[in-house]
């Protein structure tokens, strides 16, 4: 069977009782629909002895198999089998296309990999596979960060990928650290970028029939050095019931990598600050920014001792940034709360 | 169907060397990168090693960056991890897995295969 | 390289139970996320790649969002073969840092 703008085995009509296996070669990114039993009473489609579900880019429906945009790993054994029972309806194999030999004797050699020749492929420029993955076409990251420009395509005879930056031949030779050519996943990778990667960077993507290119654009935000940024309202003033569970949120953005402590103000001798100035606290948790859930503080089954002032304390390289809130302890039936007004529960 | 079976586990003592290999079955082999995992007891996932499909492109953990080293036979439908200079803290299941096409999602792994290090 | 950062790394839930695990990276990864689960003595197991991609064969219940910097797992009925640990995994650099996962206990 040569592939065709839409492989398809139509109309859906009951099968012929005499059936035999088939081999479908099918292009990368093509639609398929495949028809089994007559629609109202479809067989059911199952891809290496897995029923296929009614929705999804792969989907069993209605006695169809329908494929949205034919990916390599579609590639393998379907079988369609009649509902109610175990008979085979439709046993068929879905062949890749660029992995077969094509008739064509100026293909591009990597299209020649298969000697069985069973089937010839038409000849395809290069489309895009996943223009998703390229809706973002200006990249501003900071200094130091990694970049990754993609351009997924297909075509036959498969194209190649090149890169060119501001319109020149790019193979990273005079770059820092160099590049990382991903072919198969039609990526350049840059890693700890600087200011001197800003630019244009261009995929073109190419074979014997036609070429098609994208540009992308690199802006690199050179860092300021800065002590922690601490997200305004964080930690939030607290109101709690006794026996209950509290969280306090800290969010910290920093460079440099950071270092975060929850303190909580405690009081010694009936003073809150000793001779230096400084207040009196108590460490609860200590970590750095990478380690889980450092940036909450969890109270479990809260007291009346729990209450009392909370520090959020960030530090870097750089220097300190801190934030405080106050957690407020009632009693579990405690009239004044329920008469008290909403305003009064709260205070900032 | 898919199939990747790993093999060449076993105890080594430190600064030995060990060459794992993984066969695959079921799929075009040279038309997907394949991967290295290890999880060393009792821990997390790590990620140790990638090829190309055609072995055009490999790159490395940096924690085993200059001792390991990633090849593959298309004929042969295989890939290896051969690693040398071993330590301690390379003591680990090892797994060989598949990367999906046009992602680095891995959509099929091995079983694994124990690595220890030990005098 | 970019560190991948899980929260929390251990929940109790219950069948039927809503779960929501997040991962976190140190930079902006795009969409470059999977998310996989690993039981007791096996290979892991991909639910979801490229962030918000059901794996072929992976029940329904299994979802995936986020972009950038900041990416959630969500099951929304927690069945008893759910159990297990759940790690994400980033493929924006080179080296694919996984996250250092999460346990889903029964309460």
């Known amino acids: 069977l040569e592939a065709s703008e839409e492989v398809e085995l139509e109309p859906c009509l009951a099968p012929s009782l005499e059936q035999q296996e088939q081999e479908l070669t099918v292009a990368l990114g093509q639609p398929v629909r495949l028809c089994c039993g007559r629609a109202e009473r479809g067989g059911h489609w199952y891809k290496e002895g897995s029923r296929l579900a009614p929705a999804g880019r792969v989907r069993g429906w209605r006695g169809r198999l329908e494929i949205a945009s034919f990916l390599p790993e579609d590639a393998g054994r379907y079988l369609c089998l009649a509902r109610g029972s175990m008979i085979v309806l439709q046993n068929l194999t879905l062949i890749t296309g660029d992995s077969l030999t094509s008739s064509n004797d100026d293909e591009d050699p990597k299209s020649h990999r298969d000697p069985s020749n069973r089937h010839s492929y038409p000849q395809q420029a290069p489309y895009w596979t996943h223009p998703q993955r390229m809706e973002k076409k200006l990249h501003a990251v900071p200094a130091g960060n990694t970049v990754k420009f993609r351009c997924p395509a297909a075509g036959n005879p498969t194209p190649t990928i090149r890169w060119l930056k501001d319109g020149q031949a790019f193979h990273g030779e005079n770059r820092i650290g160099g590049i990382r050519l991903r072919h198969q996943h039609w990526s350049l990778v840059m890693e700890s970028v600087v200011p001197s990667d800003r630019g244009t960077y261009t995929c073109l993507v190419e074979n014997a029939v036609g070429s098609i290119r994208y540009n992308y654009l690199l802006d690199v935000l050179e860092r300021s050095p800065h002590r922690p940024i601490l997200q305004a309202g964080l930690p939030a003033n607290t109101t709690a019931v006794v026996g209950s569970d509290v969280e306090l949120l800290c969010k910290v953005y920093s460079d440099a990598q950071p270092h975060i402590q929850w303190l909580k103000h405690i009081v010694i001798n009936g003073s809150s600050f000793g001779a230096d100035g400084f207040p009196y606290v108590q460490v609860l948790k200590t970590a750095d920014i990478n380690s889980s859930e450092v940036e909450v503080l969890y109270l479990r089954n809260v007291s009346a001792e729990d209450a009392g002032e909370y520090t959020c304390l960030a530090g870097n390289s750089i220097g300190l940034s801190y934030q405080s809130a106050w957690l407020t302890v009632l009693p579990e039936e405690d009239p004044t709360w329920t008469a008290a007004a909403p305003e009064a529960r709260y205070t900032d | 169907q898919v199939q990747l079976l790993e093999s060449g586990g076993g105890l080594v003592q430190p600064g030995g060397s060990l060459r794992l290999s993984c066969a695959a079955s079921g799929f075009t082999f040279s038309d997907y990168a394949m991967s290295w995992v290890r999880q060393a007891p009792g821990k997390g996932l790590e990620w140790v090693s990638v090829i190309e499909g055609d072995g055009s492109y490999t790159h490395y953990a940096d924690s085993v960056k200059g001792r390991f080293t990633i090849s593959r036979d298309n004929s042969k439908n295989t890939l290896y991890l051969q690693m040398n200079s071993l330590r301690a803290e390379d003591t680990a299941v090892y797994y060989c897995a598949r990367e999906k096409t046009y992602s680095s999602a891995f959509d099929y792994w091995g079983q694994g295969t124990l690595v220890t290090v030990s005098s | 390289d970019i560190q991948m950062t899980q929260s929390p790394s251990s929940l109790s839930a219950s069948v039927g139970d809503r779960v929501t695990i997040t991962c976190r990276a140190s930079q902006d990864i795009s969409s470059d996320l999977n998310w996989y689960q690993q039981k007791p003595g096996k290979a892991p197991k991909l639910l979801i790649y490229d962030a918000s991609n059901l794996q072929s064969g992976v029940p329904s219940r299994f979802s995936g969002s986020g972009s950038g910097t900041d990416f959630t797992l969500t099951i929304s009925s927690l069945q008893p073969e759910d159990f297990a640990v759940y790690y994400c995994?980033?493929?924006?650099?080179?080296?694919?840092?996984f996250g250092q996962g999460t346990k889903v206990e029964i309460k």
């Open positions: 995994q980033q493929h924006y650099s080179p080296s694919h840092t």
